[in-house]
Amino acid sequence: EPPTACREKQYLINSQCCSLCQPGQKLVSDCTEFTETECLPCGESEFLDTWNRETHCHQHKYCDPNLGLRVQQKGTSETDTICTCEEGWHCTSEACESCVLHRSCSPGFGVKQIATGVSDTICEPCPVGFFSNVSSAFEKCHPWTSCETKDLVVQQAGTNKTDVVCGPQDRLR
Protein backbone atom coordinates (compact mmCIF):
# COMPACT_ATOMS: atom_id res chain seq x y z
CA GLU A 1 0.00 0.00 0.00
CA PRO A 2 1.71 3.25 -1.12
CA PRO A 3 1.80 6.01 1.53
CA THR A 4 -0.50 9.03 1.25
CA ALA A 5 1.39 11.07 3.86
CA CYS A 6 4.99 11.17 5.03
CA ARG A 7 6.85 11.92 8.24
CA GLU A 8 8.36 15.27 9.11
CA LYS A 9 11.42 16.10 6.95
CA GLN A 10 10.09 13.80 4.19
CA TYR A 11 8.07 14.39 1.03
CA LEU A 12 5.87 12.19 -1.12
CA ILE A 13 6.98 11.51 -4.70
CA ASN A 14 6.22 8.61 -7.04
CA SER A 15 4.19 6.92 -4.28
CA GLN A 16 7.10 6.84 -1.85
CA CYS A 17 8.43 8.97 0.98
CA CYS A 18 11.80 10.59 0.35
CA SER A 19 13.93 12.53 2.84
CA LEU A 20 14.08 16.28 2.36
CA CYS A 21 17.52 17.83 1.93
CA GLN A 22 18.97 19.39 5.08
CA PRO A 23 19.59 23.16 5.32
CA GLY A 24 22.66 24.10 3.28
CA GLN A 25 21.99 21.44 0.64
CA LYS A 26 19.86 21.31 -2.53
CA LEU A 27 18.01 18.45 -4.20
CA VAL A 28 19.69 16.72 -7.12
CA SER A 29 17.58 13.55 -7.40
CA ASP A 30 14.63 12.05 -5.57
CA CYS A 31 15.10 8.81 -3.68
CA THR A 32 14.34 5.50 -5.37
CA GLU A 33 13.63 2.05 -4.00
CA PHE A 34 17.41 1.51 -4.12
CA THR A 35 18.97 4.81 -3.00
CA GLU A 36 18.24 7.73 -0.68
CA THR A 37 17.48 11.28 -1.78
CA GLU A 38 20.51 12.85 -3.46
CA CYS A 39 21.42 16.26 -2.06
CA LEU A 40 24.49 18.42 -2.70
CA PRO A 41 25.93 21.40 -0.80
CA CYS A 42 25.05 24.93 -1.83
CA GLY A 43 27.94 26.66 -3.58
CA GLU A 44 29.96 29.68 -2.48
CA SER A 45 27.67 32.68 -1.82
CA GLU A 46 24.53 30.48 -1.79
CA PHE A 47 22.25 29.22 0.99
CA LEU A 48 19.12 27.26 1.87
CA ASP A 49 17.84 27.81 5.39
CA THR A 50 15.20 25.06 5.67
CA TRP A 51 14.75 21.33 5.12
CA ASN A 52 13.86 21.42 1.45
CA ARG A 53 13.45 19.89 -1.99
CA GLU A 54 14.74 22.94 -3.84
CA THR A 55 16.83 22.24 -6.93
CA HIS A 56 18.58 25.61 -6.64
CA CYS A 57 20.10 27.38 -3.66
CA HIS A 58 19.33 31.07 -3.03
CA GLN A 59 22.00 33.70 -3.61
CA HIS A 60 23.28 35.50 -0.53
CA LYS A 61 22.07 39.07 -0.26
CA TYR A 62 24.57 41.63 -1.57
CA CYS A 63 25.22 44.54 0.78
CA ASP A 64 25.72 47.29 -1.80
CA PRO A 65 28.08 50.00 -0.49
CA ASN A 66 26.59 52.39 -3.09
CA LEU A 67 23.36 52.17 -1.11
CA GLY A 68 25.17 52.78 2.17
CA LEU A 69 25.06 49.08 3.12
CA ARG A 70 27.71 46.94 4.75
CA VAL A 71 27.83 43.31 5.95
CA GLN A 72 26.71 42.87 9.54
CA GLN A 73 26.86 39.07 9.45
CA LYS A 74 28.38 37.01 6.65
CA GLY A 75 26.05 34.39 5.16
CA THR A 76 26.71 30.65 5.43
CA SER A 77 25.35 27.74 3.41
CA GLU A 78 22.42 27.75 5.84
CA THR A 79 21.88 31.47 6.45
CA ASP A 80 21.54 34.61 4.35
CA THR A 81 23.92 37.54 4.70
CA ILE A 82 22.61 40.24 7.06
CA CYS A 83 23.20 43.81 5.94
CA THR A 84 23.28 46.94 8.04
CA CYS A 85 24.01 50.57 7.29
CA GLU A 86 27.21 52.57 7.46
CA GLU A 87 27.77 54.83 10.47
CA GLY A 88 25.31 57.74 10.42
CA TRP A 89 22.78 55.88 8.27
CA HIS A 90 19.89 53.49 8.97
CA CYS A 91 17.82 50.93 7.03
CA THR A 92 14.71 52.05 5.19
CA SER A 93 12.94 48.74 5.84
CA GLU A 94 13.17 45.59 7.92
CA ALA A 95 14.80 43.83 4.95
CA CYS A 96 17.47 46.57 4.95
CA GLU A 97 17.68 46.96 1.20
CA SER A 98 18.86 50.58 1.32
CA CYS A 99 19.90 53.24 3.82
CA VAL A 100 19.07 56.84 4.58
CA LEU A 101 20.96 59.41 6.61
CA HIS A 102 19.95 59.59 10.27
CA ARG A 103 17.52 62.41 10.91
CA SER A 104 18.77 65.34 13.01
CA CYS A 105 16.60 66.93 15.68
CA SER A 106 16.00 70.63 14.94
CA PRO A 107 16.54 73.41 17.46
CA GLY A 108 13.77 73.17 20.04
CA PHE A 109 13.90 69.38 19.84
CA GLY A 110 16.28 66.93 21.49
CA VAL A 111 17.24 63.33 20.81
CA LYS A 112 15.00 60.93 22.73
CA GLN A 113 16.59 57.84 21.17
CA ILE A 114 19.82 57.76 19.17
CA ALA A 115 19.49 56.08 15.77
CA THR A 116 20.84 52.58 15.16
CA GLY A 117 21.63 50.73 11.95
CA VAL A 118 17.98 49.76 11.73
CA SER A 119 16.07 52.64 13.35
CA ASP A 120 15.99 56.38 12.82
CA THR A 121 16.63 59.08 15.40
CA ILE A 122 13.62 59.73 17.65
CA CYS A 123 13.21 63.42 18.56
CA GLU A 124 11.14 65.00 21.30
CA PRO A 125 10.18 68.62 21.89
CA CYS A 126 12.16 70.21 24.66
CA PRO A 127 9.80 70.66 27.63
CA VAL A 128 9.68 73.80 29.76
CA GLY A 129 12.98 74.12 31.57
CA PHE A 130 14.95 72.56 28.73
CA PHE A 131 16.34 73.78 25.40
CA SER A 132 18.27 72.72 22.31
CA ASN A 133 19.89 75.36 20.12
CA VAL A 134 21.47 73.00 17.54
CA SER A 135 20.36 70.62 14.84
CA SER A 136 21.82 67.29 15.98
CA ALA A 137 21.39 63.51 15.75
CA PHE A 138 22.96 63.06 19.21
CA GLU A 139 22.21 66.06 21.47
CA LYS A 140 19.47 65.75 24.06
CA CYS A 141 17.52 68.74 25.40
CA HIS A 142 19.70 70.50 27.99
CA PRO A 143 18.26 71.96 31.19
CA TRP A 144 18.22 75.71 31.46
CA THR A 145 21.07 77.10 33.48
CA SER A 146 20.13 77.58 37.12
CA CYS A 147 21.01 81.23 37.78
CA GLU A 148 20.25 80.88 41.47
CA THR A 149 22.97 78.33 42.09
CA LYS A 150 25.45 80.83 40.65
CA ASP A 151 24.10 83.62 42.80
CA LEU A 152 22.80 85.26 39.66
CA VAL A 153 19.36 86.21 38.46
CA VAL A 154 17.52 85.55 35.23
CA GLN A 155 17.98 88.48 32.95
CA GLN A 156 16.38 86.84 29.91
CA ALA A 157 13.97 83.94 30.06
CA GLY A 158 14.84 80.72 28.34
CA THR A 159 12.86 79.11 25.52
CA ASN A 160 12.86 75.64 24.00
CA LYS A 161 15.64 76.92 21.70
CA THR A 162 17.65 79.14 24.00
CA ASP A 163 19.11 79.00 27.47
CA VAL A 164 18.25 81.57 30.08
CA VAL A 165 20.59 84.54 30.34
CA CYS A 166 21.84 85.12 33.87
CA GLY A 167 23.06 88.39 35.25
CA PRO A 168 24.15 89.96 38.53
CA GLN A 169 21.51 90.72 41.10
CA ASP A 170 20.57 94.42 41.40
CA ARG A 171 21.80 95.63 44.83
CA LEU A 172 19.79 98.26 46.61
CA ARG A 173 22.00 101.16 47.65
Partner: antibody
Framework: QVQLVQSGAEVKKPGSSVKVSCKAS????????ISWVRQAPGQGLEWMGM????????SYAQKFQGRVTMTRDTSTSTVYMELSSLRPEDTAVYYC????????WGQGTLVTVSS | QSALTQPPSASGSPGQSVTISCTGT?????????VSWYQQHPGNAPKLIIY???KRPSGIPDRFSASKSGNTASLTVSGLQADDEADYYC??????????FGGGTKLTVLG
Protein backbone atom coordinates in the same frame (compact mmCIF):
# COMPACT_ATOMS: atom_id res chain seq x y z
CA GLN B 1 12.18 2.45 -11.20
CA VAL B 2 13.86 4.95 -13.51
CA GLN B 3 14.98 3.66 -16.92
CA LEU B 4 17.22 5.58 -19.31
CA VAL B 5 17.19 4.57 -22.97
CA GLN B 6 19.73 6.13 -25.33
CA SER B 7 19.77 6.62 -29.09
CA GLY B 8 21.72 4.32 -31.41
CA ALA B 9 25.34 4.29 -32.55
CA GLU B 10 26.63 7.10 -34.76
CA VAL B 11 29.52 7.45 -37.20
CA LYS B 12 30.65 11.03 -37.75
CA LYS B 13 33.25 12.92 -39.76
CA PRO B 14 35.85 15.12 -37.99
CA GLY B 15 34.58 18.69 -37.60
CA SER B 16 30.93 17.68 -37.53
CA SER B 17 28.54 17.45 -34.56
CA VAL B 18 26.67 14.61 -32.88
CA LYS B 19 23.48 14.74 -30.82
CA VAL B 20 22.79 11.82 -28.47
CA SER B 21 19.40 11.44 -26.80
CA CYS B 22 18.49 9.88 -23.46
CA LYS B 23 14.81 9.13 -22.82
CA ALA B 24 13.72 8.69 -19.22
CA SER B 25 10.80 6.62 -18.05
CA UNK B 26 9.60 5.87 -14.53
CA UNK B 27 9.75 8.47 -11.81
CA UNK B 28 9.18 12.18 -12.35
CA UNK B 29 11.37 13.54 -15.15
CA UNK B 30 11.82 16.98 -13.58
CA UNK B 31 12.90 15.56 -10.22
CA UNK B 32 16.41 14.39 -11.04
CA UNK B 33 19.48 15.73 -12.78
CA ILE B 34 21.07 13.88 -15.69
CA SER B 35 24.84 13.53 -15.97
CA TRP B 36 26.70 12.65 -19.17
CA VAL B 37 29.81 10.49 -19.00
CA ARG B 38 31.98 9.18 -21.78
CA GLN B 39 34.42 6.29 -22.07
CA ALA B 40 36.97 6.07 -24.87
CA PRO B 41 37.94 2.54 -25.99
CA GLY B 42 40.02 0.87 -23.25
CA GLN B 43 39.97 4.06 -21.17
CA GLY B 44 38.34 5.26 -17.97
CA LEU B 45 35.16 7.23 -17.29
CA GLU B 46 35.10 10.95 -17.94
CA TRP B 47 32.37 13.25 -16.59
CA MET B 48 31.21 15.74 -19.23
CA GLY B 49 28.51 17.70 -17.46
CA MET B 50 24.96 17.66 -16.18
CA UNK B 51 21.54 19.16 -16.81
CA UNK B 52 18.80 19.78 -14.30
CA UNK B 53 15.56 19.02 -16.17
CA UNK B 54 13.40 21.04 -13.76
CA UNK B 55 14.94 24.35 -14.82
CA UNK B 56 17.19 23.29 -17.68
CA UNK B 57 20.27 24.66 -15.91
CA UNK B 58 23.54 23.08 -16.98
CA SER B 59 27.05 22.62 -15.66
CA TYR B 60 29.85 21.45 -17.95
CA ALA B 61 33.32 20.08 -17.25
CA GLN B 62 35.90 22.70 -18.17
CA LYS B 63 37.38 20.43 -20.85
CA PHE B 64 34.10 20.48 -22.81
CA GLN B 65 33.08 24.12 -22.27
CA GLY B 66 32.11 25.70 -25.57
CA ARG B 67 31.87 22.37 -27.36
CA VAL B 68 29.09 20.60 -25.50
CA THR B 69 25.43 21.59 -25.16
CA MET B 70 22.94 19.74 -23.00
CA THR B 71 19.23 20.37 -23.46
CA ARG B 72 15.97 18.78 -22.42
CA ASP B 73 12.47 18.30 -23.79
CA THR B 74 10.06 17.93 -20.89
CA SER B 75 7.17 16.92 -23.18
CA THR B 76 9.00 13.72 -24.15
CA SER B 77 11.07 13.29 -20.95
CA THR B 78 14.22 13.35 -23.07
CA VAL B 79 17.60 14.99 -22.54
CA TYR B 80 20.11 15.61 -25.30
CA MET B 81 23.87 15.98 -25.39
CA GLU B 82 25.35 17.65 -28.47
CA LEU B 83 29.12 17.65 -29.02
CA SER B 84 30.50 19.84 -31.80
CA SER B 85 33.82 20.15 -33.67
CA LEU B 86 34.32 16.39 -33.37
CA ARG B 87 37.84 14.94 -33.46
CA PRO B 88 38.96 11.29 -33.75
CA GLU B 89 39.76 11.30 -30.00
CA ASP B 90 36.05 11.92 -29.29
CA THR B 91 35.41 8.33 -30.36
CA ALA B 92 33.84 6.83 -27.25
CA VAL B 93 30.76 5.33 -25.65
CA TYR B 94 28.60 8.14 -24.29
CA TYR B 95 26.41 7.41 -21.26
CA CYS B 96 23.63 9.33 -19.58
CA UNK B 97 23.08 8.64 -15.88
CA UNK B 98 20.70 9.78 -13.18
CA UNK B 99 22.01 12.50 -10.84
CA UNK B 100 25.60 13.15 -9.77
CA UNK B 101 25.47 9.91 -7.86
CA UNK B 102 24.64 8.10 -11.13
CA UNK B 103 22.56 5.32 -9.63
CA UNK B 104 20.90 4.46 -12.97
CA TRP B 105 22.68 4.41 -16.34
CA GLY B 106 21.64 4.35 -19.96
CA GLN B 107 22.92 1.50 -22.11
CA GLY B 108 25.48 3.77 -23.81
CA THR B 109 25.81 5.17 -27.32
CA LEU B 110 28.93 4.48 -29.38
CA VAL B 111 30.06 7.52 -31.34
CA THR B 112 32.81 6.87 -33.88
CA VAL B 113 34.64 9.85 -35.38
CA SER B 114 36.52 8.89 -38.51
CA SER B 115 37.29 10.34 -41.89
CA GLN C 1 45.26 12.64 -16.38
CA SER C 2 42.44 11.78 -13.97
CA ALA C 3 41.53 14.09 -11.13
CA LEU C 4 41.40 11.23 -8.62
CA THR C 5 44.24 8.71 -8.36
CA GLN C 6 43.54 4.97 -8.24
CA PRO C 7 46.00 2.08 -8.55
CA PRO C 8 45.72 0.66 -12.10
CA SER C 9 45.34 -2.91 -10.82
CA ALA C 10 44.58 -5.00 -7.76
CA SER C 11 44.20 -8.73 -7.24
CA GLY C 12 43.24 -11.36 -4.71
CA SER C 13 42.28 -15.00 -4.43
CA PRO C 14 38.69 -16.16 -3.91
CA GLY C 15 37.58 -15.60 -0.32
CA GLN C 16 40.25 -12.96 0.37
CA SER C 17 39.75 -9.22 0.83
CA VAL C 18 41.07 -6.48 -1.45
CA THR C 19 41.15 -2.74 -0.82
CA ILE C 20 41.30 -0.14 -3.59
CA SER C 21 42.27 3.45 -2.79
CA CYS C 22 41.11 6.66 -4.40
CA THR C 23 43.16 9.77 -3.61
CA GLY C 24 41.94 13.27 -4.33
CA THR C 25 42.50 16.70 -2.80
CA UNK C 26 41.01 18.90 -0.10
CA UNK C 27 38.78 20.39 -2.82
CA UNK C 28 37.02 17.14 -3.74
CA UNK C 29 37.33 13.93 -1.72
CA UNK C 30 38.48 15.80 1.40
CA UNK C 31 35.85 18.52 1.13
CA UNK C 32 32.65 16.55 0.63
CA UNK C 33 31.08 13.28 1.76
CA UNK C 34 29.98 12.58 -1.78
CA VAL C 35 32.26 9.79 -2.94
CA SER C 36 30.78 7.02 -5.09
CA TRP C 37 32.17 3.72 -6.36
CA TYR C 38 31.18 1.91 -9.57
CA GLN C 39 31.73 -1.60 -10.85
CA GLN C 40 31.99 -2.12 -14.60
CA HIS C 41 32.12 -5.48 -16.32
CA PRO C 42 33.47 -5.54 -19.91
CA GLY C 43 30.92 -4.36 -22.45
CA ASN C 44 28.46 -3.15 -19.79
CA ALA C 45 27.51 0.23 -18.35
CA PRO C 46 28.96 1.01 -14.92
CA LYS C 47 26.91 0.07 -11.85
CA LEU C 48 26.73 2.08 -8.63
CA ILE C 49 27.90 0.00 -5.65
CA ILE C 50 28.67 2.69 -3.03
CA TYR C 51 27.45 6.27 -2.62
CA UNK C 52 27.89 9.07 -0.06
CA UNK C 53 31.25 7.52 0.99
CA UNK C 54 29.89 4.34 2.62
CA LYS C 55 26.23 3.71 1.73
CA ARG C 56 25.22 0.69 -0.35
CA PRO C 57 22.25 0.78 -2.74
CA SER C 58 19.77 -1.92 -1.83
CA GLY C 59 20.70 -5.17 -3.58
CA ILE C 60 24.45 -4.60 -3.27
CA PRO C 61 25.94 -7.27 -0.96
CA ASP C 62 27.63 -6.16 2.26
CA ARG C 63 30.87 -7.71 1.01
CA PHE C 64 31.34 -4.26 -0.53
CA SER C 65 32.26 -1.63 2.05
CA ALA C 66 33.93 1.76 1.86
CA SER C 67 35.34 4.55 3.98
CA LYS C 68 37.17 7.86 3.75
CA SER C 69 40.06 9.40 5.64
CA GLY C 70 41.22 12.88 4.74
CA ASN C 71 41.66 13.14 0.98
CA THR C 72 41.62 9.38 0.39
CA ALA C 73 38.61 7.11 -0.05
CA SER C 74 38.84 3.31 0.01
CA LEU C 75 36.72 0.46 -1.28
CA THR C 76 37.06 -3.00 0.27
CA VAL C 77 35.75 -6.12 -1.39
CA SER C 78 35.77 -9.02 1.06
CA GLY C 79 35.06 -12.70 0.41
CA LEU C 80 36.23 -12.26 -3.18
CA GLN C 81 34.19 -14.08 -5.83
CA ALA C 82 34.94 -14.74 -9.49
CA ASP C 83 32.16 -12.32 -10.51
CA ASP C 84 33.90 -9.46 -8.67
CA GLU C 85 36.51 -9.38 -11.44
CA ALA C 86 35.79 -6.03 -13.10
CA ASP C 87 36.94 -2.44 -13.36
CA TYR C 88 36.21 -0.21 -10.34
CA TYR C 89 35.93 3.56 -10.52
CA CYS C 90 35.58 6.16 -7.78
CA UNK C 91 34.03 9.58 -8.24
CA UNK C 92 33.74 12.64 -6.02
CA UNK C 93 31.75 15.83 -6.04
CA UNK C 94 34.18 18.72 -6.53
CA UNK C 95 31.96 21.72 -5.78
CA UNK C 96 30.27 24.17 -8.16
CA UNK C 97 28.19 21.41 -9.77
CA UNK C 98 31.27 19.50 -10.94
CA UNK C 99 32.17 15.83 -10.63
CA UNK C 100 35.52 14.05 -11.03
CA PHE C 101 36.38 10.39 -11.63
CA GLY C 102 39.35 8.26 -10.75
CA GLY C 103 41.31 6.53 -13.52
CA GLY C 104 39.89 3.11 -12.62
CA THR C 105 41.32 -0.06 -11.07
CA LYS C 106 41.22 -3.46 -12.77
CA LEU C 107 40.45 -6.08 -10.11
CA THR C 108 41.63 -9.60 -10.94
CA VAL C 109 40.40 -12.63 -9.00
CA LEU C 110 43.27 -15.13 -9.07
CA GLY C 111 43.02 -18.89 -9.60
Amino acid sequence: QVQLVQSGAEVKKPGSSVKVSCKASGGTFSSYAISWVRQAPGQGLEWMGMINPSGGTTSYAQKFQGRVTMTRDTSTSTVYMELSSLRPEDTAVYYCARGFRMDQWGQGTLVTVSS
Amino acid sequence: QSALTQPPSASGSPGQSVTISCTGTSSDVGAYNFVSWYQQHPGNAPKLIIYDVRKRPSGIPDRFSASKSGNTASLTVSGLQADDEADYYCSSYAGNNRLVFGGGTKLTVLG
